[in-house]
Interface confidence: low
């Protein structure tokens, strides 16, 4: 695949890094698989200055990001080292709150309307922010 | 560089109602929690409360009752009432930003409060 | 609400010594949201260290953070003469956010 040099339309570039910010809302899975197909992923946030970037797009609403347990400890979806890396979240937050009544705990990451992290049910119809990297290896296919 | 400057009546009566009021310059108000909290002469630091740009509030159940925090986000300025004071409201008054990993890394001068009869 | 108790109350060393000052929680502080401050008489505290172990935006790097859950420390490996202040801890893992009483550095 080709190097991708510069942000896709309707993405914004913010240190090399390219982002999509979604004006609908899907569950977890729809909008990681979604990210996916648009060769990227769910947002990794992985300072404080990334935070505030994100923070500063998506204003005061629920927005997904790629941080999930469903398969037990905290995963960024790109791999980032959750144990050591940035959070965010809210003070006596992740929960894993069972008491919404929908079945299971909390299993999603979120910004909340504060910017702030929480963890919800991964079914809820959030809006979602899609990230891909420049410079790194594109699924299209080099132009000739 | 970020600065916090911040201003209000230094002397009271009890019953009163404290009114204080703090400005952001050098820097973005969006994005940050802004916060107050005060020490009484001689002792510890004490949590009034917080609020975030959009109006969020946050405030420490002890005080939850006598406090209101209000923004500007127009002027860059959040402001401080509390009401109904008391001798035991006598403190020093900080504003100040919550920063990252929610420590306060940016306080104002802080104001002296007296209330005296 | 997570109290926090500052040990020891006073602590009195002479410049180019090691300081260790010790903060412990009530409950577990999550996810490590500790900080530490300076306060000098008449001033406002300034942030020293957060997230536990990380340091502020220039603060010298002879002050260190450490510790998890309960039991945090704050150790400044060679004491300098602006250095003698007292030092706060305070968490904002659960709310309400407190402060811990202060330990008073002082020369000896």
């Known amino acids: 695949g080709s190097e991708r040099t510069c942000c896709p339309v309707n993405w914004v570039e913010h240190e090399r890094s390219c982002y999509w910010f979604s004006r609908s809302g899907k569950a977890w899975a729809d909008a990681d698989n979604y990210c996916r197909l648009e060769d990227a992923h769910l947002v990794v946030v992985t300072s404080w200055e990334e935070q505030k970037f994100v923070q500063h797009h998506i204003g005061p609403v629920n927005t997904w990001m790629g941080l999930h347990d469903q398969n037990g400890p905290w995963k960024w979806v790109d791999g980032t080292d959750y144990e050591t890396g940035f959070k965010n979240w809210r003070p006596e937050q992740p929960d894993d709150w069972y008491g919404h009544g929908l079945g299971g705990g909390e299993d999603c990451a979120h910004f909340t309307d504060d910017g702030r992290w929480n963890d919800d049910v991964c079914q809820r119809p959030y809006r979602w922010v899609c990230e891909t990297e420049l410079d790194k290896a594109s699924q299209e296919p080099p132009l000739l | 560089q970020v600065q916090l400057q911040q201003w209000g009546a230094g002397l009271l009566k009890p019953s009163e109602t404290l009114s204080l009021t703090c400005a952001v310059f050098?820097?973005?108000?969006?994005?940050?929690?802004w916060s107050w909290i005060r020490q009484p002469p001689g002792k510890g630091l004490e949590w009034i409360g917080e609020?975030?740009?959009?109006?969020?509030?946050n405030y420490n159940p002890s005080l939850k009752s006598r406090v209101t925090m209000s923004v500007d986000t127009s002027k860059k300025q959040f402001s401080l009432k509390l009401s109904s004071v008391t001798a035991a409201d006598t403190a020093v008054y900080y504003c100040?930003?919550?920063?990252?990993?929610?420590?306060?890394?940016?306080w104002g001068q802080g104001t002296m409060v007296t209330v005296s009869s | 609400e997570i109290v926090l108790t500052q040990s020891p109350g006073t602590l009195s060393l002479s410049p180019g010594e090691r300081a260790t000052l010790s903060c412990r929680a009530s409950q577990n502080v999550s996810y490590s949201y500790l900080a530490w401050y300076q306060q000098k008489p008449g001033q406002a505290p300034r942030l020293l260290i957060y997230g536990a172990s990380r340091r502020a935006t220039g603060i010298p790097d002879r002050f260190s953070g450490s510790g998890s859950g309960t039991d945090f420390t704050l150790t400044i490996s060679r004491l300098e003469p602006e250095d003698f202040a007292v030092y706060y801890c305070?968490?904002?893992?659960?709310?309400?956010?407190?402060f811990g009483q202060g330990t008073k550095l002082e020369i000896k």
């Open positions: 305070q968490q904002y893992g659960s709310s309400p956010c407190s």
């Open positions: 609020m975030y740009h959009f109006g969020n509030t």
């Open positions: 100040a930003r919550v920063g990252q990993w929610l420590a306060f890394d940016i």
């Open positions: 050098g820097g973005s108000f969006s994005g940050h929690y």
